[in-house]
């Protein structure tokens, strides 16, 4: 049975709208919820595509609007169609198309042939896509001053670039409780908007924003040590694209240290956590004397999945410890703002030479020639095998 509607179903999830001049908007298409494919042709009154037009078309994979009167596609037109992978807007009246329109989409192909596209920086992204062979871009005609059949390069003296963004930070060290002033300087042609991204800063400081393009200011009031390793980002957009720069404010605070009890893993480990900014230097003591690290006993930091914290975790790793390693381990941590120490007792093995005074004293008779293989059981304090 032939369909006499403006739009007719094609298969289980397609819609085809080809009756000439019957649509001026795509809003409110019937049964649009499950649509994966929408084909529109010969709609001279369809001149604009706004984000509201495609609301409710969350499953849309393919959109074709051809031989119609499309003059403008809003930068956020496809906000509600994140799965869109095929876009054909050929043979319309489009003079430009913003990079924002396709931002966030995983387009496999984009067809814009047969449009009076005007060569400008606003289409520089498209020229780059075509040159790089991205997602099967087809443009065929891009007008510089007049019609042409190929993608005309922008004039040599035309400088199309995304904005340049720089963040100025304080040179001096920042301490807990300080107010920090940051300034974001933006340079570029046809700047549209700019702002700060401060999502990581919650609880680390109170934020005050001021100023506008080309210079945005930010005051972080009463900063805490939680601000360390958190990104402060400034972004800016123009016709060509978007640029952003991130910095981290380093907030100095004193060293702190925590030690755990020795645990036997693949090797023995005395676990520790140290914090402080700048990162503290570490030194181990064994029974009050400096412990020289070797491949048998050394500090090993754990690889942290969290790159946004100053605290570092690790082990004093002991390979094959014996009774001579039993004793008091102290970790000293120091930075310019303070020092801290923590100690823990560790017992790895009983001393095989310890005996109860009540026990009979073992006596060994050495041969006269002195070729005995028995050892003096006295442990000499200065002969630790890990030194």
């Amino acid at each position: 049975a032939s369909c006499r509607e403006v739009c007719c179903p094609v298969g289980p999830s397609g819609l085809r709208c080809t009756r000439a001049g019957s649509l001026d908007t795509l809003r409110g298409l019937r049964g649009a919820g499950n649509l994966t494919e929408l084909y529109v042709e010969n709609q001279q009154h369809l001149q604009r595509l706004e984000f509201e037009d495609l609301q409710g078309l969350g499953e849309l994979r393919s959109l074709t609007i051809v031989k119609s009167g499309l003059r403008f596609v809003a930068p956020d037109a496809f906000r509600f169609t994140p799965r869109l992978s095929h876009l054909n807007l050929s043979s319309n009246a489009l003079e430009s198309l913003s990079w924002k329109t396709v931002q966030g989409l995983s387009l496999q192909d984009l067809t814009l042939s047969g449009n009076p596209l005007h060569c400008s920086c606003a289409l520089f992204w498209l020229q780059r896509w075509e040159q790089e062979g991205l997602c099967g871009v087809h443009t065929q005609t891009l007008h510089d001053s007049g019609p042409g059949d190929q993608f005309l390069p922008l004039g040599h003296n035309t400088s199309c670039g995304v904005p340049t963004v720089k963040i100025q930070m304080p040179n001096d060290s920042v301490e807990v409780g300080d107010d920090v002033f940051l300034q974001c300087q933006v340079e570029g042609l046809a700047l549209q908007q700019a702002d700060w991204i401060l999502t990581e800063l919650e609880g680390a400081a109170t934020v005050k924003k001021f100023g506008d393009l080309p210079s945005l200011g930010l005051i972080l009031v009463n900063v805490t040590s939680d601000l360390n390793k958190k990104n402060v980002t400034c972004w800016a957009e123009n016709d060509v694209g978007r640029a952003e720069v991130s910095v981290q404010v380093s907030v100095s605070f004193p060293a702190s240290v925590h030690l755990g009890l020795a645990v036997e893993q693949h090797h023995w480990c005395i676990p520790f956590s140290v914090d402080g900014q700048p990162a503290p230097s570490l030194r181990w003591l064994f029974n009050g004397s400096v412990l020289n690290e070797t491949s048998f006993i050394f500090t090993q930091f754990l690889e942290s999945a969290l790159t946004n914290e100053t605290m570092r975790h690790g082990c004093l790793r002991l390979n094959q410890p014996t009774h001579v390693n039993n004793g008091n381990y102290t970790l000293l941590a120091a930075n310019p703002y303070g020092q801290a120490a923590a100690s823990v007792m560790a017992a790895f093995m009983d001393n095989p030479f310890e005996f109860n005074p009540e026990d009979p004293i073992p006596v060994s008779f050495s041969p006269v020639d002195g070729n005995s293989t028995s050892r003096d059981p006295v442990e000499k304090k200065d002969e630790t095998p890990f030194g």
Epitope: E293, S295, F296, F298, F301, Q320, R375, T384
Partner: antibody, heavy 118, light 107 residues
Framework: QVQLQQPGAELVKPGASVQLSCKAS????????IHWVKQRPGQGLEWIGE????????NYIEKFKNKATLTIDKSSNTAYMQLSGLTPEDSAVYYC???????????WGQGTLVTVSA | DIQMTQSPASLSASVGDTVTITCRAS??????LAWYQQKQGKSPQLLVH???TLAEGVPSRFSGSGSGTQFSLKISSLQPEDFGTYYC?????????FGAGTKLELK
């Protein structure tokens, strides 16, 4: 798989210095100390020293303290040993080695033969 | 430093024989002893660590024993590929030291 790659040979003049390399692959370079061992022709094995690739910390046997200098280049996963003031007694094969899961040398480089000759 | 004394310095044997090499430490090294085999012009290969634990891929005809200061490596039913030089090494802290080696030759 774990590999320690060393160049085959170096010919140097008496009094000069030489830098030997040991390029590691197949494991996390910073997790294991690198050791160096000397073997003179027809002789036994002699431990020279060790270096922690994570922080460059070194330990040497006394007799090599003024002869050998161990360094690390983390970016290329390479350990180096510089031998200075070379004499004919320094002519030997020099091996780099690392522990396996236990504290014994499960992995060795092929060794670099250093010949000190005028 | 801990001294390691190996004996004999050399040893002749035939395929199928059983041989034992001994190693003495100058002080107690508990069970922290390793054995290596080296063929002419090649790097040493780990055979045994912690006195008696065989390294990966080492045949069961090799066995280690001992503790404290006295250690031995026994090779049962010698195979042609077993001839070479054997070294003991303590792994009880640095500096690490090796024995002078035992050269096992075909009789």
């Amino acid at each position: 798989q774990v590999q320690l790659q060393q160049p085959g040979a170096e010919l140097v003049k008496p009094g000069a210095s030489v830098q030997l390399s040991c390029k590691a692959s197949g494991y996390t370079f910073t997790s294991y100390w690198i050791h160096w061992v000397k073997q003179r022709p027809g002789q036994g094995l002699e431990w020279i020293g060790e270096i922690n690739p994570n922080n460059g910390l070194t330990n040497y046997i006394e007799k090599f303290k003024n002869k050998a200098t161990l360094t690390i280049d983390k970016s290329s996963n390479t350990a180096y040993m510089q031998l200075s003031g070379l004499t004919p007694e320094d002519s030997a094969v020099y091996y780099c080695a690392k522990y396996g899961n236990y504290v014994a040398f499960a992995y060795w480089g092929q060794g670099t033969l250093v010949t000190v000759s005028a | 430093d801990i001294q390691m004394t190996q004996s004999p310095a050399s040893l002749s044997a035939s395929v199928g024989d059983t041989v034992t090499i001994t190693c003495r430490a100058s002080e107690n090294i508990y069970t922290y002893l390793a054995w290596y085999q080296q063929k002419q012009g090649k790097s040493p290969q780990l055979l045994v660590h912690n006195t008696k634990t065989l390294a990966e891929g080492v045949p069961s005809r090799f066995s280690g024993s001992g503790s404290g200061t006295q250690f031995s490596l026994k090779i049962s039913s010698l195979q042609p590929e077993d001839f070479g030089t054997y070294y003991c090494q303590h792994h009880y802290g640095v500096p690490l030291t090796f024995g002078a080696g035992t050269k096992l030759e075909l009789k």
